[in-house]
């Protein structure tokens, strides 16, 4: 796995431990919490990042608690089970043997059950809406400039193939970035839209996951784009199923 050779760090994930013990003395980095080797030339999966976040000391974790307006994980931050590829396992269980099924971004999509609960497959979140509200500016941003800048950001910073940024909508002060990626469209090596959205969300909150890079400095034609708050809508290929009992107030 590639990593910065000179000081053996992982440019795409600061929640790692790196050492030159790879083949031929190459730098190898492992995610905190899971100890899994990560590919530092691309984004680390959200599952491994959440696991690393949960492994951080409690006092360090308070530093990265979501802000009042941020989208929090549905049942609070939890310590997920990740598969050998670093993806969320379809079934997640807590220490008291309460289990539930999640989608590919780790959001619960079934009622909670016991250890007998079956989650046949990891349902893909194929469509992500990122709604941003920017701080007041002298005038509205030019839509095409804004579109180009956000597409560039996802391409260059998050290494997301441009075809997965379906649209950038703008109605001042709301910006909506639409990411779309069906199972059939995602090739080996493609960054997952869920991972890109998670990195972006953390960047926007000033909690960058990148090693040693400055925080996100978004500018449209030199004008700073300051995000007031973010909402992320996750939409699955297969609709979630809940019992009516779950819906009872």
């Amino acid at each position: 796995h590639t990593a910065a050779q000179d000081n053996c760090t992982c440019p795409t994930n600061k929640m790692t431990v790196c050492s030159p013990d790879g083949p031929g003395g190459r730098c190898q980095c492992r995610a905190l919490g899971s100890g899994m080797a990560v590919d530092c030339s691309t984004l680390t999966s959200k599952c491994l990042l959440l696991k690393a976040r949960m492994s951080a000391p409690k006092n360090a974790r308070t530093l990265v608690r979501p802000s009042e307006h941020a989208l929090v994980d549905n049942d609070g931050l939890y310590d997920p089970d990740c598969d050998p590829e670093g993806r969320f396992k379809a079934r997640q269980c807590n220490q008291t043997s309460v289990c539930w099924c999640v989608n590919s971004v780790g959001v619960r999509r079934t009622d909670k059950g016991d250890l007998s609960l079956r989650c046949d497959e990891l349902v893909r979140t194929h469509h992500i809406l990122i709604d941003l509200r920017h701080r007041p500016t002298a005038g509205a941003f030019n839509h095409s400039d804004l579109d180009a800048e956000l597409r560039r950001l996802f391409r260059e910073r998050y290494r997301l193939h441009p075809k997965f940024v379906a649209a950038v909508h703008y109605e001042q002060p709301t910006i909506q970035i639409e990411l779309r990626q069906n199972t059939s469209q995602k090739a080996a090596g493609d960054v997952d839209i869920g991972d890109a959205a998670y990195y972006f969300e953390r960047d926007i909150k000033g909690e960058s996951l990148f090693q040693g890079r400055g925080g996100l400095d978004l500018r449209v034609r030199g004008e700073p784009l300051q995000v007031e708050r973010t909402l992320i809508y996750y939409l699955d290929e297969i609709p979630p199923k809940f019992s009516m009992k779950r819906l009872t107030a």
């Epitope: 989208l71 709604d131 109605e171 809508y233």
Partner: antibody
């Protein structure tokens, strides 16, 4: 002025199909996600589903998933709701509604039509 | 059986202030999703009253205001008028259901 005019409601037997439509005017229809919301007699509002501004994506409420289909014709400024395998509990006033902002899809509703009554009864 | 919980009814005398609560959970209001409020006067279609928790569309009097905290939201109506009588619904988005969700509605009676 935004206008949304539903049509096609009526009485239908359980198990049958019905298509209701909504004619939109007063705004750039192709820029807005559109919703259907229903209200059973004397009951509250229930979301039926949304269709993206370009028609590429549709999402539905749990109770109609697999039976109802939302479509749109942006050249005709028309929204449709195809209802199959109708049940007595589908009896409601069906409202066509426009997303508040011209994003691809927006889960907040701005303007509403006056509704069309669909009665499912044998 | 609504995802968002509202009191079935509230009432107040003309000129008074009333509030309507809307309680959700960690997958809707508590997850940061916005709350919107709709007014449905007798025999008419719903009308947007408050959007994004606190904002009023043009034409809605400033007697109507919204707030949100944690997993709940509230609609406040001051200077109650007879023609405010009707049903009021809160609405949000639920990430577990992948769906837009409504409260069960609150009937406002002006005494």
């Amino acid at each position: 002025e935004v206008q949304l005019l539903e049509s096609g409601g009526g009485v239908v037997q359980p198990g049958m199909s019905l298509r209701v439509s909504c004619a939109a005017s007063g705004f750039t229809f192709s820029n807005y996600g559109m919703h259907w919301v229903r209200q059973a007699p004397g009951k509250g509002l229930e979301w039926v589903g949304i269709i993206w501004s370009d028609g590429t994506y549709t999402y539905y409420g749990d109770s109609v998933q697999g039976r109802f289909t939302i479509s749109r014709d942006n050249s005709e400024n028309t929204l449709h709701l195809q209802m199959n395998s109708l049940r007595a509990e589908d009896t409601a006033v069906y409202y066509c509604a426009k997303s508040l902002t011209p994003l691809g899809g927006s889960f907040r509703i701005g303007d509403w039509g006056q509704g069309t009554l669909v009665t499912v009864s044998s | 059986q609504s995802v968002l919980t509202q009191p079935p009814s509230v009432s107040g005398a003309p000129g008074q202030r009333v509030t309507i609560s809307c309680t959700g959970s960690s997958s809707n209001i508590g997850a940061g999703y916005d709350v919107h409020w709709y007014q449905q006067l007798p025999g008419t279609a719903p009308k947007l009253l408050i959007y994004d928790n606190t904002n009023r569309p043009s034409g809605v009097p400033d007697r109507f205001s919204g707030s949100k905290s944690g997993t709940s939201a509230s609609l406040a109506i001051t200077g109650l008028q007879a023609d405010d009588e009707g049903d009021y619904y809160c609405q949000s988005y639920d990430s577990r259901l992948n769906a837009l969700v409504f409260g069960g509605g609150t009937k406002l009676t002006v005494l």
